[in-house]
């Protein structure tokens, strides 16, 4: 007997073939011999079966022997044995009908889980296994777990189902609520204006919720909330910001923040949160804040950063075209009695430079 | 709800090939069939051919000579492809699914052939 | 090949007029015929499948009657929205064929 798969909601062809090339009478019957439809004459006759308002068949291959069955928005009750009576023989084809569901909404937050559950018809016995867009592999029974989604889980599910042999595949979109990036740092000079971006990782038609970013400065004992704001159909609006830092927002996403000058006090990390309307959970995005500063003061040349910056980075001061330098992996250097001329302060990270601040320095008389 | 998206080169040269593609959104491609219809401008319609997702095809007699129909089901598209084409090809091609009757239908490609 | 013939090739109708198109096949296809409403520029529309069966969506004013060679399409009173041009086509052999079209024009 042959096996054929189907999709909850699908539209499966079962196929029966007459050895002769023609116009002959043929019936569809169900396994408990209900008569689903058959032939009349040229015209196509149904019989009492729940399923004659979902089946057909395609009168213009009837002139080539073959008789199949099509049924339409398929039901996991469809699995059964059908029989297909042509020629005074009989063909019989099981069925059997799957569905693939996630359990919850399929638009989760970063760091939720994921259940997908399979729907099978009795008796059977299948096994399933998904891959993720990152391509990622699962493997289950009846229902397959994800514990932490990831962003990179974002996008369409494969999933395999497999029984007897045979395979139905199943496509699920899913979408991981998230920024594009889990941290960012921002590298300025001292009085530079300073943007923030937090683009999301995700399109939604209707977008809604709410924000805060709060702000822990490296010279600060405790954090504190910098800005707070509304998010309505992807127009942002400023509930409240703090006097100092003054920072402006933009009104359209991605969601923007101007800080109007890079200063050291404001140096330090922050955590900007997205509270989205219908979801349980934050969206969280980290962001640092770098700040340089060179300064000559009498005999001392110095060149500071403050904010999160890793041991491995090196400050390096050093004068143009001379090779005078003086490096280090520390959050300040300078050189004494200066020889005159630009001198440049350098933040760099395994030889890239990730901030330069340029100083003058007079010769004294 | 189903929909049908096609593309495809709008502009020919005489014995050129004609190359159209059909993607199926939101509804299921086994099962069904899949068509190509075409209609010269004032004119009447006329079935090019079908396609079914394993691969299945049948074709206008008028027509087989120079027509393929294929399959992508992975992408649940298929396409058609007309050889060495002449004035007489110029038409909105439409894609369409069926049973036995034609719905829904793609949104239309004007080809146009001419030197 | 089975070859469709509409009748009339043109017709010209008022709001509220009851309106009949004729379609005959050239050999016996049952009821194996679909009714189409094509407007410019616009893809065709099913509105009757099996010779009778009004299409989801479609307009009760819309009807199929007929089998064998002979079918007609009613409908029973015009609309503004009703104005386009008509195809029959046979589902019953390869090639699926049409009718030439007609065309619904207001008077």
């Known amino acids: 007997k042959k096996v054929v798969l189907g999709k909850k909601g699908d539209t499966v062809e079962l196929t029966c073939n007459a050895s002769q090339k023609k116009n002959t009478q043929f019936h569809w019957k169900n396994s408990n011999q209900i008569k689903i439809l058959g032939i009349q004459g040229l015209f196509l006759t149904k019989g009492p079966s729940k399923l004659s308002d979902r089946a057909d068949s395609r009168k213009s291959l009837w002139d080539q022997g073959c008789f199949s069955m099509i049924i339409k928005n398929l039901k996991i009750e469809d699995s059964d044995t059908y029989i297909c009576e042509v020629e005074n023989k009989k063909e019989e084809v099981e069925l059997l009908v799957f569905g693939l569901t996630a359990n919850s909404d399929t638009h989760l937050l970063e760091g939720q889980s994921l259940t997908l559950t399979l729907e099978s018809p009795p008796g059977s016995s299948p096994s399933v296994k998904c891959r993720s867009p990152g391509g990622k592999n699962i493997q289950g029974g009846r229902t397959i777990s994800v514990p932490q989604l990831e962003r990179q889980d974002s996008g369409t599910w494969t999933c395999t189902v497999s029984q007897d042999q045979k395979t139905v595949e199943f496509k699920i979109d899913i979408v991981v609520l998230a920024f594009q990036k889990a941290s960012s740092t921002v590298y300025k000079k001292e009085g530079e204006q300073v943007e923030f971006s937090f683009p999301l990782a995700f399109t939604l038609e209707k977008l809604t919720g709410s924000g805060e970013l709060w702000w822990q400065a490296e010279r600060a004992s405790s954090s504190k909330s910098w800005i707070t704001f509304d998010l309505k159909n992807k127009e942002v609006s400023v509930k409240r910001v703090t006097q100092d830092p003054k920072l402006q927002m933009g009104k359209k996403l991605p969601l923007h923040l101007t800080l109007p000058q890079a200063l050291p006090q404001y140096a330090g990390s922050g955590n900007l949160t997205l509270a989205l309307e219908a979801k349980t959970g934050k969206l969280h995005q980290e962001v640092n804040l770098v700040v340089m500063r060179a300064t000559q003061f009498q005999e001392n040349l110095t060149c500071e950063v403050w904010g999160p910056t890793s041991p491995k980075l090196t400050l390096s001061l050093k004068l143009e075209n001379k090779g005078a330098t003086v490096s280090k992996q520390a959050k300040a250097v300078w050189v004494l009695n200066p020889e005159a001329g630009m001198w440049q302060c350098l933040l760099s990270d395994s030889g890239q430079v990730l901030l330069e601040s340029n100083i003058k320095v007079v010769p004294t008389w | 709800q189903v929909q049908l998206q096609q593309w495809g080169a709008g502009l020919l040269k005489p014995s050129e090939t004609l190359s159209l593609t059909c993607a199926v959104y939101?509804?299921?491609?086994?099962?069904?069939?899949w068509s190509w219809i075409r209609q010269p401008p004032g004119k009447g319609l006329e079935w090019i051919g079908e396609i079914n997702h394993s691969g299945s095809t049948n074709y206008n007699p008028s027509l087989k000579s120079r027509v393929t129909i294929s399959v992508d089901t992975s992408e649940n598209q298929f396409s058609l492809t007309l050889i060495s084409v002449t004035a007489a090809d110029t038409a909105v091609y439409y894609c369409?699914?069926?049973?036995?009757?034609?719905?829904?239908w793609g949104q239309g490609t004007l080809v146009t052939v001419s030197s | 090949d089975i070859q469709m013939t509409q009748s009339p090739s043109s017709v010209s109708a008022s709001v509220g007029d009851r309106v009949t198109i004729t379609c005959r096949a050239s050999?016996?296809?049952?009821?194996?015929l679909a009714w189409y409403q094509q407007k410019p520029g616009k893809a065709p529309k099913l509105l009757i499948f099996?010779?009778?069966s009004l299409q989801s969506g479609v307009p009760s004013r819309f009807s199929g009657s007929g089998s064998g060679t002979d079918f007609t399409l009613t409908i029973s009173s015009l609309q503004p929205d009703d104005f386009a041009t008509y195809y029959c086509?046979?589902?019953?052999?390869?090639?699926?064929?049409f009718g030439q079209g007609t065309n619904l024009g207001i008077k």
């Open positions: 939101g509804g299921s491609f086994s099962g069904y069939y």
């Open positions: 369409v699914r069926l049973i036995n009757w034609f719905d829904p």
């Open positions: 099996a010779a009778s």
């Open positions: 050999q016996d296809i049952s009821n194996w």
């Open positions: 086509q046979q589902a019953n052999s390869f090639p699926y064929t």
